[in-house]
């Protein structure tokens, strides 16, 4: 079996997680793609997905999660803005390919969000500021409900720093005039 690897991101509340998942261009360019969270003993939960068929570079936003699929370069960009401690957890990008099981894109993302003033740059941070001038619009994309049961058994144990995301959808509120410090992956 393929050994699943994780990439760890340690960020502070209010920052932006920005990761890139790459895929085989020719095979998956217009396939629907999704961002999932993996919780112990459960099937991965889809938090956001691209449209079907996926549109080139056009952002799809669900709450605080923004997906951008760059077809020509085989790249799915995932951003989670205004991070909260509760967002900590294990995430993955997948490609939906019905009737087959979703295809997982490596690596999985181990996100650890800690409390703290995000205006002070740390080891994984920078001082470039981002201004949200208007509340972003939300585009709801219809995501298939199925996920591979096999993925559950592959999930590594949670780290002690891990805090599960609540079952409620991740929502973005009160973003007007808030200063954020982005961390682009």
């Amino acid at each position: 079996a393929t050994k699943l690897t994780e990439e760890k991101y340690e960020l502070k509340e209010g920052q932006t997680l920005d990761v890139k998942c790459d895929y085989t261009l020719e095979k998956f360019a217009s396939s629907q793609k999704a961002w999932q969270i993996i919780r112990d003993g459960e099937m991965p939960k889809t938090l956001a997905c691209t449209e079907r068929p996926s549109k080139n570079s056009h952002p799809v936003q669900v709450g605080r999660i923004i997906l951008e699929d760059y077809h020509d370069h085989g790249l799915l960009r995932v951003r989670m803005v205004n991070l909260q401690v509760e967002d900590s957890g294990l995430y993955q990008c997948v490609i939906y390919q019905p009737p087959k099981e979703p295809h997982m894109l490596f690596d999985r993302i181990r996100l650890v969000v800690t409390k703290g003033f995000s205006g002070t740059p740390g080891s994984n941070e920078n001082s470039t500021q981002n201004v949200y001038k208007i509340p972003p619009t939300t585009t709801k994309a219809l995501c298939p409900l199925y996920t591979s049961p096999r993925t559950v058994t592959q999930a590594p144990p949670k780290s002690t720093a891990d805090v599960s995301t609540p079952d409620s959808e991740i929502n973005l509120t009160n973003v007007t005039d808030i200063i954020r410090v982005p961390v682009f992956n």
């Epitope: 990439e7 920005d18 790459d22 570079s57 952002p59 760059y70 949200y132 208007i134 682009f184």
Partner: antibody
Framework: EVQLVESGGGLVQPGGSLRLSCAAS????????MSWVRQAPGKGLEWVAN????????YYVDSVKGRFTISRDNAKNSLYLQMNSLRAEDTAVYYC??????????WGQGTLVTVSS | DIQMTQSPSSVSASVGDRVTITCRAS??????LAWYQQKPGRAPKLLIY???RLQSGVPSRFSGSGSGTDFTLTISSLRPEDFATYYC?????????FGQGTKVEIK
């Protein structure tokens, strides 16, 4: 065919202001992050600023923060860079570029900004 | 910010030569590195993205490799139109940063 055409460059005195424009065509402008990248005479490339598809997020390099403002008008397929309190070290060719996830895939021809007294 | 160091700063070569340019990142950037070619008075042109993927329309004599901190651009057989300055760009850490450039000159 993707095209980016910059305009608005010129000679300006230190402390002065200038507004650069970039006219985009050949692609769905409103679907892409856009950037300004500059190159001082005989020097290398430096990313200056970028802006999200809907204009709701802006990012700047530290050296221009508080002085430059990036904006866009999706109805006009146009990108702008308002440059205030200009300094001699801002002298450069300014390029408009399309962000494509992990690279700048298309660039304009550039417009020269000279800050000198 | 992530610093990108290119070497050499210039290289003299002849048509038909194999030319190798390296770029080193001050910290790991996975595979998120692009290479550009720039000729005098012209805008940069994207050659390679994601460390090794060839941009559409770019000749196959250009190739890229590497991941983490060390990356290489190779021109397998130099052509007259390849004499130019080459830049690397990292897109892993924000802000995106360029290398200082490598000028490929005629020997």
């Amino acid at each position: 065919e993707v095209q980016l055409v910059e305009s608005g460059g010129g000679l300006v005195q230190p402390g002065g202001s200038l507004r650069l424009s970039c006219a985009a065509s050949g692609f769905t402008f409103s679907s892409y992050w856009m950037s300004w990248v500059r190159q001082a005479p005989g020097k290398g490339l430096e990313w200056v600023a970028n802006i999200k598809q809907d204009g709701s997020e802006e990012y700047y390099v530290d050296s221009v923060k508080g002085r430059f403002t990036i904006s866009r008008d999706n109805a006009k397929n146009s990108l702008y860079l308002q440059m205030n309190s200009l300094r001699a070290e801002d002298t450069a060719v300014y390029y408009c570029a399309r962000d494509y996830g992990e690279s700048f895939d298309y660039w304009g021809q550039g417009t020269l900004v000279t800050v000198s007294s | 910010d992530i610093q990108m160091t290119q070497s050499p700063s210039s290289v003299s070569a002849s048509v038909g030569d194999r030319v190798t340019i390296t770029c080193r990142a001050s910290q790991g950037i996975r595979k998120w590195l692009a290479w550009y070619q720039q000729k005098p008075g012209r805008a940069p042109k994207l050659l390679i993205y994601a460390a090794s993927r060839l941009q559409s329309g770019v000749p196959s004599r250009f190739s890229g490799s590497g991941s983490g901190t060390d990356f290489t651009l190779t021109i397998s057989s130099l052509r007259p139109e390849d004499f130019a300055t080459y830049y690397c760009l990292q897109a892993h850490g924000f802000p995106w940063t360029f290398g200082q450039g490598t000028k490929v000159e005629i020997k």
